[in-house]
């Protein structure tokens, strides 16, 4: 009994390895590789119903290489892990699990959320928005002249979009009613709307003043008296009583 085992064992030695495939140091007909040449990893490969030993330069998916003095082996990652650095540190989890600090979890811990693209537990990201941009010019139907009451708008940008569990973004647009001194449209603006379409010459008293920028428009709620004639001041008193209304749109 021992003798037959001994005879077989003698054929396994590294110095009697004729017939061994590739990286095998020792082998047998029945089992394939028994041990591997330096730096190669032993692994079991299923061929039909049988598992045989093979020697590999790197371990297959689901395994990592363990090295001990003169004996290296491919060792299985944990059951829920697809690729790992070692038994206790997974780098990619199997389907249905989320990676967090080298572990594969059914659910992400408190304060984290599952990223279903990377299959990792990630920090919850809340929305971040910029400061408001200045108010736009006061307009009505796209025009900045020929009216008394219009609307003005301001916007802000989304700096950071929120993750699934993050706080939603606040409104990024605000619109409010505004009032301006009624001024007739200038030559370049005439004829865009309504009756003005047919008029070819400007009125004698039409203002040549440039369209105010957003800053001057924003202060139009409190235009200094010295910038208005007496007739306009009377109109302004009425207008000031009408409080501006703000309308927000949520994104």
């Amino acid at each position: 009994q021992n003798a037959s085992r001994g005879r077989r064992q003698r054929r396994m030695h590294p110095n009697v390895s004729q017939g061994c495939q590739g990286g095998c140091a020792t082998c047998s007909d029945y089992n394939g590789c028994l041990s591997c040449k330096p730096r190669l990893f032993f692994a079991l490969e299923r061929i039909g119903m049988k598992q045989i030993g093979v020697c590999l330069s790197s371990c297959p998916s689901g395994y990592y290489g363990t090295r001990y003095p003169d004996i290296n082996k491919c060792t299985k990652c944990k059951a829920d892990c697809d690729t790992c650095f070692n038994k206790n540190f997974c780098t990619k989890c199997k389907s249905g699990f989320y990676l967090h600090l080298g572990k594969c979890l059914d659910n992400c811990p408190e304060g984290l959320e599952a990223n279903n693209h990377t299959m990792e537990c990630v920090s919850i990201v809340h929305c971040e928005v910029s400061e408001w941009n200045p108010w736009s010019p006061c307009t009505k139907k796209g025009k900045t002249c020929g009216f008394k009451r219009g609307t003005e708008t301001r916007v802000r940008e989304i700096i950071q979009h929120p993750s699934a569990k993050g706080n939603l973004c606040p409104p990024t647009n605000e619109t409010r009613k505004c009032t301006v001194q009624r001024k007739k449209c200038q030559k370049g603006e005439r004829g865009k709307k309504g009756r003005e379409r047919k008029r070819k010459k400007p009125n004698k008293g039409e203002s040549k003043e440039a369209i105010p920028d957003s800053k001057s428009l924003e202060s139009s709620k409190e235009i200094p008296e010295q910038r208005e004639n007496k007739q306009q001041q009377k109109k302004r008193k009425v207008q000031d009583k009408q409080k501006s209304v703000s309308v927000s749109t949520v994104h």
Partner: antibody, heavy 119, light 107 residues
Framework: EVQLVESGPGLVKPSETLSLTCTVS????????WNWIRQPPGKGLEYMGY???????YQNPSLKSRITISRDTSKNQYSLKLSSVTAADTAVYYC?????????????WGQGTLVTVSS | DIQMTQSPSSLSASVGDRVTITCKAS??????LSWFQQKPGKAPKTLIY???RLVDGVPSRFSGSGSGQDYTLTISSLQPEDFATYYC?????????FGQGTKVEIK
């Protein structure tokens, strides 16, 4: 046929060093992996470590600070030294061999030698 | 370290009985498991390696099975010479660890 035979003192005093030798015949210790395993009386088996065909060693971390495995290729022998022994180290000590992950582990064993730690 | 939990710790059986001994590893050991038989005053003898491969000269009434964490040694028809203590051993990683042993006694 591969044969392994343990030898060494059967009695060691506490705090001293236990020294055993395994003499191998029918094979060269420059192939395979040569191991030490022990078994306290009436208890289970404990793996201690090995010396490889190239002379590299592995020691069980539970014993690492106390264990030394070495070899003498000219005599085809390998040895175990266990320092600072206590009564808990009283056991039958076995040498055994294997040839790699794909073959039988500990296909060959020595007959074992009982070492008693007592003053 | 991987722990090997062997059960039962002892069993009584008669010649001709089918005997099953189990070993559970604390983690997946990927079939790197051997079974040993030890008789009083003797060194252990390897019966099975890589879960189910019989060592040359071991009677075919011994068989091994299992995967992952759970492994079984079966003696299909117990013979008088089979009364002994049986140990499992994992060698998936170092340090290797043995089960606590199962003593098979005559009923």
């Amino acid at each position: 046929e591969v044969q392994l035979v343990e030898s060494g003192p059967g009695l060691v005093k506490p705090s001293e060093t236990l020294s055993l030798t395994c003499t191998v015949s029918g094979d060269s210790i420059t192939s395979g992996y040569w191991n030490w395993i022990r078994q306290p009386p009436g208890k289970g088996l404990e793996y201690m470590g090995y010396i490889s065909y190239s002379g590299k060693t592995y020691q069980n971390p539970s014993l690492k600070s106390r264990i030394t495995i070495s070899r003498d290729t000219s005599k085809n022998q390998y040895s175990l030294k266990l320092s600072s022994v206590t009564a808990a180290d009283t056991a039958v000590y076995y040498c055994a061999t294997y040839y790699g992950y794909g073959g039988p582990w500990f296909a060959y064993w020595g007959q074992g030698t009982l070492v008693t730690v007592s003053s | 370290d991987i722990q090997m939990t062997q059960s039962p710790s002892s069993l009584s059986a008669s010649v001709g009985d089918r005997v099953t001994i189990t070993c559970k590893a604390s983690q997946d050991i990927d079939s790197y498991l051997s079974w040993f038989q030890q008789k009083p005053g003797k060194a252990p003898k390897t019966l099975i390696y890589l879960t189910n491969r019989l060592v040359d000269g071991v009677p075919s009434r011994f068989s091994g099975s299992g995967s992952g964490q759970d492994y079984t040694l079966t003696i299909s028809s117990l013979q008088p010479e089979d009364f002994a203590t049986y140990y499992c051993l994992h060698y998936d990683e170092f340090p290797l660890t043995f089960g606590q042993g199962t003593k098979v006694e005559i009923k």
